[in-house]
């Protein structure tokens, strides 16, 4: 039960006090008691419950005509059952007794009021009155947890605006309101109560730039909402009429959890006594609601796809046809960024990552815009963000970034359990160097901090700086599977490729050509690839790098070898010993449910079929997956990327609610 104020009674004159329903009010009967009195008794109106405890140990007893010893060990507390119809309509009489004196009486006139700030602390999507039931001042995780949730109002419901909804002080319409969380102030007081009392709604100064609160005028249009708390206003005096009254507030978060903001926001209502104009206002009561800002959540390849994004560039019509066919098979919407908007930047995966935010009453896709800021710089803001599609970005917007800040270097695993610890939303994966050096690359600290601060998909740092481009999607992918953990981790594997080529040579196919049918591309015989000592050394190094990640992933995702599939792939080391795919990198695939868009490797054709394609199909088709090999050679591969790099996917949010997990 909430703590009320301390009331001191004195026999000299009647005491007037306010008692808020649902609070426990301490009664000080000792400090002003007549000197020669040794005991007391209490009588109260029917609407007041008095508890007397004499301890230690505390033995509680409700009031009757009994007398109690007047000593400091006696605790007297009051609670009110009903709100008062008029000021001071509930009375408490304390009688003091002494051996030689007649009884001395002290009178206390109580006004019972109902004041409660309610939000959806039970996470049902509805605001229910919770007076005296739960402590709203704490926020707890897990299925039995409690605490309200806020969304960052980061979409753009007004198509004529270039800004996010949370960047203005206005409520556009009911659509805008739906992105906010409802908070209700319920009051029940005597009619004249607010002539001597005031309610003030406030937020800590340290949190005022993270939240905005709008006050709604009941029964009026949403446009009548006016801002009462926010970056410029930490407190607001409320004009509340006496009697029974409900006041609605709509709350939007302005910032995502981050390194300097744990995501918790406390809104407090304070009841102030303003009856004495000569003195400062005195706090009578406070009620608070704690909100947690919903984290930005990534979706893994195992989540059903809803929309595919790709770029139109010079001569990639065939690539787009293949992606279109795949999207249709997977029943996905397809969005193509035209040439005039992408400015010859085809790397859709690198520019953005589409996740979502969720509250019990609303789920919103949110695009995380990378700070790479090349030709596609404007695409997430101008074409993705919109009504019910949010936007967030982090990191320096001009310079100071590396290739590891592109979001081909940002992936997320499917849900996993690791040594008994559950990650029901998976774990974020991003690439890094294995140790810092003068020229090593790492994901910008601002991005790392943001990802960690979301709490619900604890990040794992992998080693990707050995690659020329340096992205984790160059050596790993996840595909759905009907058994085991519900997915398989795919890893690029030089060892597997050499084994396959050796088998083909042993069967007399050493003359078969890699890159056959590609104009202006030097073809390579299986036997020459196998005999090239330098290429073998390079791939031995690459294998070690991938194996390092393999062990890391097994440990951090709780995987067994049987959860991993090796995809045959060769690499070559280029300048500064950085690796690039030797032929189109098949692990860099587009996963749309059971439909996979895999870079066409142009491997040696044996008995009329590419042996690399055949091998990959034999590994993935038993899982119910359908492999489509897409020719991305001249439009993507030779520009250091593949199918996954050139596409992006919005996926269905998890059915699991993030607040039900325990980070």
């Amino acid at each position: 039960m909430a703590q009320g104020t301390l009331i001191r009674v004195t026999p000299e004159q009647p005491t007037h006090a306010v008692c808020v329903l649902g609070t426990l009010t301490q009664l000080d009967i000792c400090s002003s008691a007549p000197e020669d009195c040794t005991s007391f008794s209490i009588n109260a109106s029917p609407g007041v419950v008095v508890d007397i405890a004499h301890g230690p140990p505390a033995k509680k007893k409700s009031t009757g005509s009994s007398t109690w010893p007047l000593d400091p060990g006696v605790e007297v507390t009051l609670t009110m059952k009903v709100a008062s119809g008029s000021t001071g309509d509930q009375k408490v009489q304390i009688s003091y007794y002494g051996p030689k004196t007649p009884p001395v009486k002290a009178l206390l006139y109580l006004t019972g009021v109902e004041i409660s700030l309610c939000a959806d602390i039970t996470r049902t999507g509805k605001v229910k009155p919770t007076r005296a039931v739960k402590d709203q001042r704490t926020w707890t995780w897990g299925p039995c947890g409690q605490g309200a949730i806020l969304l960052v109002n980061c979409d753009r419901d007004n198509l004529e605006s270039s800004a996010m909804d949370c960047e203005d002080d206005e409520v556009l319409d009911s659509e805008d309101l739906q992105d906010m969380s409802l908070m209700t102030l319920s009051t029940k007081t005597p009619k004249d109560f607010f002539t001597n009392h005031t309610l003030v709604l406030h937020v800590a100064r340290s949190e005022m730039d993270k939240v905005r609160v709008f006050q709604a005028t009941r029964g009026k249009l949403s446009s009548k909402c006016s801002v009462v708390l926010g970056p410029k206003w930490p407190s607001h005096y409320l004009m509340v009429p006496g009697g029974k009254h409900n006041m609605d507030f709509y709350v939007e978060a302005l910032a995502f959890p981050d390194t300097d903001f744990p995501g918790l926001i406390t809104l407090t209502i304070s009841l102030l006594d303003t009856s004495n104009l000569e003195l400062p206002e005195a706090v009578v009561f406070q009620d608070s609601v704690v909100f947690r800002v919903a984290p930005w959540i990534m979706t893994p390849n195992t989540q059903p796809p809803q929309e595919v994004y790709a770029c139109s560039i010079f001569e990639n019509e065939d690539f787009l046809k293949s992606v279109t066919t795949l999207a249709m098979k997977a029943k996905c919407k397809l969005t193509i960024c035209p040439e005039e908007e992408n400015m010859d930047d085809q790397w859709m995966q690198d520019e953005m990552e589409i996740g979502y935010i969720q509250a019990p009453h609303k789920t919103l896709p949110v695009v995380f815009d990378s700070p790479r800021n090349r030709g596609l710089k404007e695409f997430p803001i101008k074409r993705v963000m919109g009504p019910d599609f949010g936007y967030v970005t982090r990191g320096p917007q001009t310079g100071g970034i590396s290739g590891l800040d592109s979001f081909g270097n940002l992936e997320v695993s499917p849900p996993v359990t690791v040594r008994g610890k559950e990650y029901p939303l998976g774990r974020i994966l991003f690439g890094d160097s294995c140790y810092p050096s003068n020229d090593s690359r790492q994901m910008h600290q601002a991005l790392q901090d943001f990802l960690s601060a979301q709490q619900v998909q604890a990040p794992v740092k992998l080693y990707s700086d050995w690659l020329s481009v340096g992205h984790v999607d160059e050596f790993l992918s996840f595909v759905p599977a009907p058994d085991r953990k519900g997915f398989r981790l795919l890893l690029a594997s030089p060892r597997s490729c050499y084994k396959l080529f050796q088998e083909q040579q042993n069967e007399g196919h050493g003359e078969a050509l890699l890159f056959e049918g590609i104009k202006k591309k030097k073809q390579q015989k299986i036997k020459n690839i196998l005999s090239n000592k330098t290429l073998r050394e390079h791939n031995s190094f690459v294998e070690r790098c991938i194996d390092w990640n393999r062990e890391l992933l097994k440990r951090e995702l709780g995987l067994a070898e049987s959860d991993i599939i090796d995809i045959p792939q060769l690499f070559k080391l280029k300048e500064f010993s950085k690796a690039e795919a030797f032929f189109p990198n098949m692990v860099n695939m587009l996963v749309l449910g059971k439909h996979l868009g895999i870079p066409k490797p142009f491997g040696p054709v044996i008995n009329g079929r590419c042996c690399l394609e055949e091998k990959v199909c034999s590994l993935l088709e038993p899982l119910g997956l359908q492999c489509t090999f897409i020719n991305d050679f001249f439009t993507y591969h030779i520009r250091h990327g593949e199918v996954h790099c050139g596409t992006n996917v919005r996926r269905k949010p998890f059915s699991f609610k993030w607040w039900n997990m325990v980070p």
Partner: antibody
């Protein structure tokens, strides 16, 4: 064959900044590794910085690391060298040079370590 | 003080051969086959004449040849001609924190 033209040099006070540009013509610069090399008056060549064709990694000489930043804008067919906290010893002719990133080689040909096309250079003078 | 050591000057008569040495360490010249040579005439930009120790770009006469032994690379110019008079610089990839090193340069005088 690509041709390179440097610009942006000039006189600057110690502690000041300059941004050098290297504009390419005759070919697409996105197919090329690019390095900046400098030559102090009457002295030898000194390698300064490198950016790969894919625009995914960069390297610097110890003498400029933390002060200079190399970048490229393939849409503009240009590479840049942002020079901050300039010192008197940075006075030199700055050359932009490039080498084709030949994807046909079976293994690394070392093209990032040599410069087969050079611009004419731009003079940077750091003096108070 | 340059990282790779070259003689300050060499000279030869027309038609003769000259060799310019470039000495590094086991962390650069000795480790990698990424040694290149540049020719620079006064007031002009350098020009690549040898790369990957001994390979010649198209258009460079075969009078220019390169080799390497241990930590030392060499540039040999046979059948010297007057237009060969210039400064010559060697360069190598290095595993040090500055990944490309140059020699101090050698002035070739054709007598």
């Amino acid at each position: 064959q690509v041709q390179l033209v440097e610009s942006g040099g000039g006189l600057v006070k110690p502690g000041g900044s300059l941004r050098l540009s290297c504009a390419a013509s005759g070919s697409t610069l996105s197919d090329y590794f690019v390095s900046w090399i400098r030559q102090a008056p009457g002295k030898g060549l000194e390698w300064v910085s490198f950016i790969n064709a894919a625009n995914t990694f960069t390297y610097y000489a110890d003498s400029v690391r933390g002060r200079f930043t190399i970048s490229r804008d393939n849409a503009k067919n240009s590479v840049y060298l942002q020079m901050n906290s300039l010192r008197a010893e940075d006075t030199a002719v700055y050359y932009c040079s490039s080498a084709n990133d030949d994807v046909d080689d079976i293994v690394a040909p070392g093209r990032g370590y040599y410069m087969d096309v050079w611009g004419r250079g731009t003079l940077v003078t750091v003096s108070s | 003080q340059s990282a790779l050591t070259q003689p300050r000057s060499v000279s030869g008569s027309p038609g003769q051969s000259v060799t310019i040495s470039c000495t590094g360490t086991s962390g650069d010249v000795g480790r990698y086959s990424h040694v290149s040579w540049y020719q620079q005439h006064p007031g002009k930009a350098p020009k690549l004449i040898i790369y990957n120790v001994y390979e010649r770009p198209s258009g460079v006469p075969d009078r220019f040849s390169g080799s390497k032994s241990g930590n030392t690379a060499s540039l040999t110019i046979s059948g010297l001609q007057a237009e060969d008079e210039a400064d010559y610089y060697c360069s190598s990839h290095s595993r040090s924190s500055t990944p490309v090193l140059f020699g101090g340069g050698t002035k070739l005088t054709v007598l």
